[in-house]
């Protein structure tokens, strides 16, 4: 059987697959998924290995019309480096010479300057090019190679291994060489895979059942460290509770060098955040940190300095801490908008079982703002999801020059932020460089400001506007209001009406359903429309909602189903990557972010059309 990294190299025109008959004869044959000689896989960013021979595809020289054969894999060899060129062409790196079969009655696969159909290759059984099954570096643990990546294939006791092995061990632990010749270099590490005994790589906190892995012997960049954690279904460490910091201080007390944790300010327009999307509500900076020097966007925990945190350049090579297991954040359930009949007094706006009101004109210090909200039967607003924040931004009349108190503060316990209404902190969205908690003035309260409504800590004595929030009162079944310019069941936002399509549909079916309603699958023109849509669908239990974006027409170029330019994107991490497909909005912890899915997957969807009676603004000129 093929493992997920392996593939057959298929030419559609000949309807044949590449077959490594011997190291010196790479030819084609009728495709057979059980034939070892037809299985290949990427073993580096640019090398393709024959699974049968554990040798790599290469050429004797970068010249036209030379035979492609198999060579001992050498990551430094220029003659073994392949790349995908516009779509399904496979060529030797840096040259216009392609992997070709069928010219001049030649039986072998040749390197050839022609880029016609006989130089085009796909993964057998798919429409994808070979690079879609690309190489993913596997970072090792323990061992003696400082966490370096596995080198496949590697030689151990004169035998070649294309995968992690337990050879030489009686306990089943899987390891790999980190250079191609373990016998000479003696460099290796354990694989970040599940095997019997691999739990002992983790320390479990008996109080919370969360597990931590301290990789103090590794030397990786922040991004590599994060990848290593993710390969173990974990994430770089986040610390949201004082108990957690205390436990980790103990766990790392015998160490001296810094260890990467998940804290970073890598997002272009927002502030400090945890890579696992935990809220940044507990601060334990080293005095003088975070330093404002550009580029110091990643954070290390300093065992030698009482496990306090310091921001560094992300390319520094350090050890790291991974975290996996239960998180305390999931215990607080926010009701989805559709579950809650929401009735609010005049001038209050309903959302998901609560009512909200902006007080912009009567400026108050935080303490007085809180008193006013409580007198009105509520509290300064707490915000628990991106959807709730996006509701406030897109539907409450929030303005880009606003600076408004919200309920977050660290008045009770310094450097530990809590909501004034007592609800748990499950979400934060800080402005770039925030929270700054400037030492020369006590910044214990939090405001929402700027075009995105992100947050900053602020001295509590500033007179500012504020946002109140209270629980709505349920009064029997909700009256469905028909919004002006929209049909019943549609929701209005600015010039448009929107409707959730409730039947699970493929992209094409969803598009057709919208068209039948004289509408189209939603486009998303800017940050504010995105905010509205996030608040519209984000709290719902379904995982995905189709938008009108896809690269069906031209692979690699995403277009809306209607003739409108793509002027705004909101991709999830690692998206769109090389995956062709159709775009859906995520819900839940990644609320509103865009993922590329296979177009025949089934999801709910959002339809959109111009509201009636609206004058169309002129199309922007480019």
């Amino acid at each position: 059987l093929l493992d997920t990294r392996q593939f057959l190299i298929y030419n559609e025109d000949h309807k044949r697959c590449v077959d490594a008959v011997s190291p010196s004869a790479v030819q084609t044959a009728a495709c057979n998924q059980d034939a070892e000689s037809q299985k290949f896989r990427w073993v580096s960013e640019s090398q393709i290995m024959s699974v049968a021979f554990k040798l790599c595809l290469g050429v004797p020289s970068k010249t036209d019309w030379v035979a492609i054969t198999l060579y001992a894999c050498d990551s430094k060899s220029e003659f073994q480096k392949w790349e995908c060129k516009n779509d399904t062409l496979l060529g030797i790196k840096g040259e216009d010479l392609f992997f070709n079969y069928g010219n001049r009655q030649e039986k072998n696969i040749m390197l050839y300057k022609g880029s016609g159909l006989w130089s085009r290759w796909k993964i057998y059984g798919t429409t994808d090019n070979l690079c879609s099954r690309g190489y993913e570096a596997m970072y090792t643990l323990l061992g003696n190679a400082n966490g370096a990546t596995c080198a496949f294939p590697f030689k151990f006791e004169n035998k070649w291994y294309a995968d992690c092995t337990s050879a030489g061990r009686s306990d089943g632990w899987l390891w790999c060489g980190t250079t191609t010749d373990y016998d000479t270099d003696k460099l290796f590490g354990y694989c970040p895979l599940k095997f019997e005994g691999s739990e002992s790589l983790w320390n479990k906190d008996p109080l919370t059942s969360v597990s931590y892995q301290i990789n103090s012997k590794s030397a990786l960049t922040w991004h590599q460290a994060r990848k290593s954690c993710q390969q173990q279904n974990a994430e770089l460490l986040s610390i949201t509770e004082i108990h957690e910091q205390t436990y980790l201080t103990g766990l790392t007390s015998s160490l001296t060098s810094g260890l990467w944790i998940g804290l970073n300010s890598l997002s272009f327009n927002s502030g400090w955040q945890w890579s696992d999307r935990s809220p940044f509500r507990y601060l334990n900076w080293l005095p003088g940190s975070p330093s404002a020097e550009p580029g110091k966007s990643c954070v290390s925990l300093n065992p030698g300095k009482n496990a306090k945190w310091e921001n560094l350049e992300c390319v520094q090579k350090l050890g790291y801490i991974c975290k996996k297991g239960n998180t305390t954040l999931n215990s607080f359930v926010i009701p989805s908008e559709s579950d809650v009949p929401t009735h609010c007094p005049s001038q209050w706006w309903p959302y998901a079982g609560h009512c909200y009101k902006i007080h912009r004109d009567e400026k108050k210090i935080q303490r007085d703002a809180l008193t006013t909200c409580r007198k009105e039967g509520g509290d300064l607003t707490s915000i628990h999801t991106i959807e709730e924040l996006d509701f406030i931004i897109s539907q409450l009349g929030y303005e880009p020059n606003d600076e408004l108190w919200i309920g977050l503060n660290d008045i009770k316990i310094q450097m530990y932020f809590e909501w004034s209404d007592g609800t748990p902190v499950t979400f934060t969205k800080w402005l770039r460089g925030e929270p700054s908690h400037e030492n020369n003035r006590q910044e214990d309260c939090v405001v929402m400001k700027g075009k995105d409504g992100y947050w900053a800590d602020r001295g509590c004595e500033w007179p500012l506007g504020y946002i109140c929030k209270m629980k709505s009162r349920s009064q029997g079944p909700e009256i469905v209001e028909v919004e002006k310019g929209c049909r019943k069941g549609w929701k209005k936002h600015h010039f448009y009406c929107y409707m959730i399509g409730h039947t699970l549909s493929t992209f094409a079916e969803a598009n057709q359903t919208c068209n039948n309603e004289n509408a189209y699958l939603t486009t998303i023109e800017d940050r504010y429309e995105q905010a509205f849509l996030t608040s519209f669908v984000g709290l719902r239990p379904e995982k995905y909602f189709w938008t009108g974006l896809s690269d069906i027409q031209t692979k690699g170029t995403f277009q809306w189903t209607i003739e409108e330019e793509v002027r705004f994107t909101h991709w999830n991490s690692d998206m769109p990557g090389r995956k062709p497909g159709c775009v859906a909005m995520r819900t839940g912890i990644a609320g509103g972010l865009w993922d590329v899915l296979k177009c025949d997957e089934k999801a709910k969807f959002v339809c959109k059309h111009w509201a009636e009676g609206v004058t169309h603004p002129p199309k922007p000129t480019t």
Epitope: G143, N144, A167, R169, D171, W173, Y182, F188, G197, S200
Partner: nanobody, 119 residues
Framework: DVQLVESGGGLVQPGGVSETLLCSLW???????HGWYRQAPGKQREEVAA???????NYADSVKGRFTISRDNAKNTVYLQMNSLKPEDTAVYYC?????????????WGQGTLVTVSS
């Protein structure tokens, strides 16, 4: 790069006072398992008792109820307490550690300590 040092053993009377063997790891290692093995003259080496890093134990039928394996993580030492010794317990006792270390090889052996049960 791994050394196991055994101590204890010697001449013991049958059924007499218990004897405790010690096995110390030369340096602290991330280890999975420790075991005691023995080899009587002219016989194959056999497993006597084992203890994993999680504290699970396993005993050969011939010693169940008489021998106890235990470990002290702080001292990096594994003990084999032998009670109600019989002449057939006479053998060279070897300590084995299955470790995660700076080589991929997992099994390391001590040099062995002789236990003679004789009146």
């Amino acid at each position: 790069d791994v050394q196991l040092v055994e101590s204890g053993g010697g001449l013991v009377q049958p059924g007499g006072v218990s004897e405790t063997l010690l096995c110390s790891l030369w340096k602290h290692l991330h280890y999975q398992c420790h075991g005691w093995y023995r080899q009587a003259p002219g016989k194959q080496r056999e497993e006597v008792a084992a203890i994993t890093s999680g504290g699970s134990t396993n005993y050969a039928d011939s010693v169940k109820g008489r021998f106890t394996i235990s470990r002290d993580n702080a001292k990096n030492t594994v003990y084999l307490q032998m009670n109600s010794l019989k002449p057939e317990d006479t053998a060279v006792y070897y300590c084995k550690a299955v470790v995660v270390t700076t080589t991929p090889y997992s099994d390391y052996w001590g040099q062995g300590t002789l236990v003679t049960v004789s009146s």
